[in-house]
């Protein structure tokens, strides 16, 4: 069946694919192009009500923080 | 170049726990686009992934063997391990470390692998 | 679970010859499918990513197409080096799954 990650299972999924990022639970502010305050699609809705893949958890990894100059 | 070798015993007893380290040479396990996998191999059979960690330390399990497995880095040592507790007869294998770039370069696939240790389970 | 598929799961061929493998997927992973060549005694080695990309040292006989849930491995003039097994790799989702293999023999 499709695949779902819920609870543990998915903070472990995040972890592993985000790295050293980190992550976010919803989608940062700003994210997409809508200027409307719309209902925030969270992680939880996505992955553990729906099929996940990794492209889609990949979407709630935190930005790289820049390096900093020397 | 980068290279994996995987080392342990070739041997290990039904009930107990198989131990196996991939020491990764020719290169830094830090970078933050690799992250490193298990796959075993049963003898004439096809490939099955096991799971993966990344230098911090974060794993991800296939869940058809989560509660056996567990994955550890030792960034000191270049080193990532594997160990299975409660192994039977069905865990016998060829057990292979990958690398697997990840997030970085936008794919997941195993670009680099050991050569591979025969594990026997066995009385 | 990604089920993974591959027809024929045995091919007898002659150098030369062209040899096509498929593999399907148990629904869509969009382009994310890795093929491998493995050699008796060896490890698997990465040939296709993102279902057409070749890897780096690959030779060009080897290509890869497909999309969806369906995928094709294409060697178009095989040499005695290419007769080994190949497996298909989702890329998708969790937990990665590989195909049961094609094995490619000297006819």
């Known amino acids: 069946g499709p695949e779902t990650l819920c609870g543990a299972e998915l903070v472990d999924a995040l972890q592993f694919v985000c790295g050293p990022r980190g992550f976010y639970f919803n989608k940062p502010t700003g994210y997409g192009s809508s200027i409307r305050r719309a209902p925030q699609t969270g992680i939880v809705d996505e992955c553990c009500f729906r099929s996940c893949d990794l492209r889609r958890l990949e979407m709630y990894c935190a930005p790289l923080k820049p390096t900093k100059a020397a | 170049q980068l290279q994996l070798q995987e080392s342990g015993p070739g041997l290990v007893k039904p009930s107990e726990t198989l131990s196996l380290t991939c020491t990764v040479s020719g290169g830094s396990i830090n970078s933050s686009s690799n992250y490193w996998g298990w796959i075993r191999q049963p003898p004439g059979k096809g490939l099955a992934w096991i799971g993966g960690?990344?230098?911090?330390?974060?794993?991800y399990y296939n869940p058809s063997l989560r509660s056996r497995v567990t994955m550890s880095v030792d960034t000191s040592k270049n080193q990532f391990s594997l160990k299975l507790s409660s192994v039977t007869a069905a865990d016998t294998a060829v057990y292979y470390c990958?690398?697997?770039?990840?997030?970085?370069?936008?794919?997941?696939?195993?670009?680099?692998w050991g050569r591979g240790t025969l594990v026997t389970v066995s009385s | 679970d990604i089920q993974m598929t591959q027809s024929p799961s045995s091919v007898s061929a002659s150098v030369g010859d062209r040899v096509t493998i498929t593999c399907r997927a148990s629904?869509?992973?969009?382009?994310?499918l890795a093929w491998y060549q493995q050699r008796p005694g060896k490890a698997p080695k990465l040939l296709i990513y993102t279902a057409s990309s070749l890897q780096s040292g690959v030779p060009s006989r080897f290509s890869g197409s497909g999309s969806g849930t369906d995928f094709t491995l294409t060697i178009s003039s095989l040499q005695p080096e290419d007769f080994a097994t190949y497996y298909c790799?989702?890329?998708?989702?969790?937990?990665?799954?590989f195909g049961p293999g094609t094995k490619v023999d000297i006819k």
């Open positions: 629904r869509g992973i969009s382009s994310w």
């Open positions: 960690i990344y230098y911090s330390g974060s794993t």
């Open positions: 990958a690398r697997q770039r990840g997030h970085s370069s936008g794919w997941w696939y195993f670009d680099l």
């Open positions: 790799q989702q890329a998708n989702s969790f937990p990665f799954t």
